[in-house]
Amino acid sequence: FAATFYDIETLKVIDEEWQRTQCSPRETCVEVASELGKSTNTFFKPPCVNVFRCGGCCNEESLICMNTSTSYISKQLFEISVPLTSVPELVPVKVANHTGCKCLPTAPRHPYSIIRR
Amino acid sequence: FAATFYDIETLKVIDEEWQRTQCSPRETCVEVASELGKSTNTFFKPPCVNVFRCGGCCNEESLICMNTSTSYISKQLFEISVPLTSVPELVPVKVANHTGCKCLPTAPRHPYSIIRR
């Protein structure tokens, strides 16, 4: 809207900033136990894992940045039950990794999930 | 706790994952108007900016990842007032950028702020 009033360099910097804030998969860390809905006597080491999740801004305030495609990454974690009745077990935990995002009008009931195998 | 039961490579991968999820400044995008607490007739283009904010996991559930040091980055944005009585104004908006983070027991009153000059 202001191309005639400001120098091209300033507008370019502003535009680049906007592009970088757009809705896209971003590396984020998620707490495994809370996402798995595990009871408080079961926890994981490490308790968090790095995955890509949709985030960023949309062109309209009413739209939400949400995942359109998902892959599942297997993370090796120690599952610990308290009280400690056995040796902590190394288990593969499948974590949702967002591979595609889109600005959509409403939030889904289940934006992502974690599957234990 | 499990060094005797699992091979060093597996433990190394798990440890690297854990290091990457630790509480630290992470690039994130924030919506300027909502953070400034501006009325709906004032908005910014772009509406979002990229800054570093504290995020990640702590070793204990009772701790929260919070900022311990902050710098302020000046972002050039168009401030638009509706009804449009004048040309959109290019204004410097100072945005809090977290430079240091720590796992602390309670949330601060003002985790971050945005200053208009």
Epitope: F1, A3, L11, D15, W18, Q19, Q22, C58, N59, E60, E61, S62, K102, C103, P105, T106, A107 | T40, F43, K45, P46, P47
Partner: antibody, heavy 118, light 112 residues
Framework: QVQLVQSGAKVKQPGASVKASCKAS????????MYWVRQAPGQGLEWVGY????????TYNQKFKGRVTMTTDTSTSTAYMELRSLRSDDTAVYYC???????????WGRGTLVTVAS | DIVMTQTPLSSPVTLGQPASISCRSS???????????LHWLQQRPGQPPRLLIY???NRFSGVPDRFSGSGAGTDFTLKISRVEAEDVGVYYC?????????FGQGTKLEIK
């Protein structure tokens, strides 16, 4: 200032396709969603769908799904809407409209009249 | 789809007098983010529509202050404090809270 310049009127036969264009100027094209709205003669407004020019993501009204395709060319800041398998009740003025961050369609093109007749 | 119902469909008004148009939605237009995306458009004869009010009550650029919007939830009103000759045309309410975006059937404002 913001301007949306639309292609001229078109006459098509039933079953044919039509492609309307909308050239934007005066703002950052990729920063705003582009909507398409149609208006049949003497009737009200009907939303066809929109495209996010930043990444080409589209959302269409279910009524037109399978018949409509929206695209953009960011190098020329132009949005396109193609409607296929035209019927006589597709006769309408097709408007492109820029949508602000707050949801209002703040700038409109003058419209492209599409007439479907045998 | 959200149905937007406008009343009256036709409104003959005397110049200088106030006018009021009502718009009712079949579902609440309050978004999960707390905002209400209800907008008003004006379409003068032979012209494309023009944005008057966005988000219930915010006047758009260049819109005279005789136009005002109000309402909440499912019931909304557009008021013109003193009708002028240039206000003749069709007025539409529109919602963008839900997809598809829908419009009211329009209210024709004419001078008595």
């Amino acid at each position: 200032q913001v301007q949306l310049v639309q292609s001229g009127a078109k006459v098509k036969q039933p079953g044919a396709s039509v492609k309307a264009s909308c050239k934007a100027s005066g703002y950052t094209f990729t920063g705003y969603n582009m909507y398409w709205v149609r208006q049949a003669p003497g009737q009200g407004l009907e939303w066809v769908g929109y495209i996010d020019p930043y990444n080409g993501d589209t959302t269409y009204n279910q009524k037109f799904k399978g018949r409509v395709t929206m695209t953009t060319d960011t190098s020329t800041s132009t949005a396109y809407m193609e409607l296929r398998s035209l019927r006589s009740d597709d006769t309408a003025v097709y408007y492109c409209a820029r949508t602000s961050y707050y949801g209002g369609m703040d700038y409109w093109g003058r419209g492209t009249l599409v007439t479907v007749a045998s | 789809d959200i149905v937007m119902t406008q009343t009256p469909l036709s409104s003959p008004v005397t110049l200088g007098q106030p006018a009021s148009i009502s718009c009712r939605s079949s579902q609440s237009l309050v978004h999960s983010n707390g905002n209400t995306y209800l907008h008003w458009l004006q379409q003068r004869p032979g012209q494309p529509p023009r944005l008057l009010i966005y988000k219930v009550s915010n006047r758009f650029s260049g819109v005279p202050d005789r136009f005002s919007g109000s309402g909440a939830g499912t019931d909304f009103t557009l008021k013109i404090s003193r009708v002028e000759a240039e206000d003749v045309g069709v007025y539409y309410c529109s919602q963008s809270t839900h997809v598809p975006r829908t419009f009211g059937q329009g209210t024709k404002l004419e001078i008595k």
